[in-house]
Amino acid sequence: LPKAPVITTPLETVDALVEEVATFMCAVESYPQPEISWTRNKILIKLFDTRYSIRENGQLLTILSVEDSDDGIYCCTANNGVGGAVESCGALQVKMKPKITRPPINVKIIEGLKAVLPCTTMGNPKPSVSWIKGDSPLRENSRIAVLESGSLRIHNVQKEDAGQYRCVAKNSLGTAYSKVVKLEVEVFARILRAPESHNVTFGSFVTLHCTATGIPVPTITWIENGNAVSSGSIQESVKDRVIDSRLQLFITKPGLYTCIATNKHGEKFSTAKAAATISIAEWSKPQKDNKGYCAQYRGEVCNAVLAKDALVFLNTSYADPEEAQELLVHTAWNELKVVSPVCRPAAEALLCNHIFQECSPGVVPTPIPICREYCLAVKELFCAKEWLVMEEKTHRGLYRSEMHLLSVPECSKLPSMHWDPTACARLPHLDYNKENLKTFPPMTSSKPSVDIPNLPSSSSSSFSVSPTYSMT
């Protein structure tokens, strides 16, 4: 007898894992045999859809490899023309181990800003997300929170937030870990110790000290009066993200020295600056102060001018007398740029013998000043024009420094060889006599204010001097 369809095993909720098989069974009793169709979310499943297998006259629906999009309500409908069609429905719940769909990435962030490390997940049941920093679970606090999305948000990032992070997604089916990412916290360059200003005597050694920190570790550059430092030695050391820079200077002029700490954040730079002034106290003191010692000259500039193996006075009011006095001569020659071939050797002899004065050893080593007559010979005969120009520049303040005031003696204040021949020094390079002087062109309209002393003539060249140190 014909019999209307009856579904003897109604559909049930099926739990299935992704990529596994899920089967719905719709057992029907009827006569004649019914036609069974299947829908998912009220949309007909086509018989030729290769993702499905329909067997047992349509009573078994198998999803061959479950995807998360297969979630939904599945219904079977049976109809054999006798009575009405019957339907039974059941849900497919796609269960899914946790999966991290948007993992965190390495982040570089400047201290004080907000950092967000993404961690978007999938899974059924919905995974819970936690974070690990280093080897330990990350604790949330007022600054650090795990958002609903699973992302980690850090407000007002601090240096100590830097490190290695990974997110962990967990549900009843399993656990997923992201790869380890690095949070790098960059810190603007900052000066921890600024260089100190100094008031020193000419020829002192001064060490300017500048300490800076930042992430990445900054570089330190030194600026002297607005330009890159042209002399001095720089020693640097880096320890625990702190850079320590020491600029050692040999002081020959005042200056403003600026320490600049710079580091790079992406395409941008951050900079911190600190400045110190070096001023020079008591410019003329070294020539007045007779504290020092006698030693053989071993420098370069005055090699050809000073008597061989001569003992010279080294003034200990300089930190390094030998270097300071050598530099004085060298700089003085550079200050007196335009000199004639007649003036040059005489000026060199005067400068060298004035700065490296002959020294009288004894209980108290004493410098022996140049005899006034020799000084005036240079001033009023050999270098008359040059001397006038220099004095004019001095009065108009055109010299870069006051250093030359130490280099050129004031002839009137020197002892005369007529007072005490042993109290002053002669200039060996001015080997001339009154006859030789007639051959020099007149350089001044006025007569020399002293009688030029008779000196023994020399067969050697009177003005041979090392060209390396010429004044031009």
Partner: antibody, heavy 121, light 113 residues
Framework: ELQLVESGGGLVQPGGSLRLSCAAS????????MSWVRQAPGKGLEWVSA????????YYKESVKGRFTISRDNAKKTLYLQMNSLKSEDTAVYYC??????????????WGQGTLVTVSS | QAVVTQEPSLSVSPGGTVTLTCGLS?????????PDWYQQTPGQAPRALIY???SRHSGVPSRFSGSISGNKAALTITGAQPEDEADYYC?????????????FGGGTKLTVL
Amino acid sequence: ELQLVESGGGLVQPGGSLRLSCAASGFTFDDYGMSWVRQAPGKGLEWVSAIPWNGGSTYYKESVKGRFTISRDNAKKTLYLQMNSLKSEDTAVYYCAKRSGRIAFGALDAWGQGTLVTVSS
Amino acid sequence: QAVVTQEPSLSVSPGGTVTLTCGLSSGSVTSSNYPDWYQQTPGQAPRALIYSTNSRHSGVPSRFSGSISGNKAALTITGAQPEDEADYYCALYMGRGSNKDYVFGGGTKLTVL
């Protein structure tokens, strides 16, 4: 950071030649005198040669005069020692050293780590 | 050629004072020799301590001082520390006419017991 890095050392036969170089950084090279000092294995220090800041003159230990030549290239911040007619007694670690000032002679306030020169057949 | 002489070895107790000397085989050491002192620890390059008789290089502790005493240059360490154990060399400038030389002594091995 102030650095002096020597190079050019090695094994050479008696009578042979070597050229040592010393690359300077971290200071104003052309403001300072420079020297070469050597130290034979297990022995003391021995000054070899010196040159002032501008290269205007050169100075040598008597036993190397005529065989060794010191020079400097201030633009390249490099000091050189050309060693010819080498003898077994020239075997030593050769140090490049910086003067504390411009002149050739005086205290050496910064040293390289040295380069070994071995003269042997 | 003049030889620069130093004690081959000396020892000092921690906290003690020791004086190393530097002489010339012929003649006296004077300020014209500009005595310099260096310290060298095994495997390291030398380090300058004192220049031109008695000036300390920057960074050198104040326990190191230099002088000329009698006919010799001297380096005195006041309050010796274990890290002061090293070889110490003096160097003298020798200038005669156009001949200029810089001569090291044989070195003094200082032990801090």
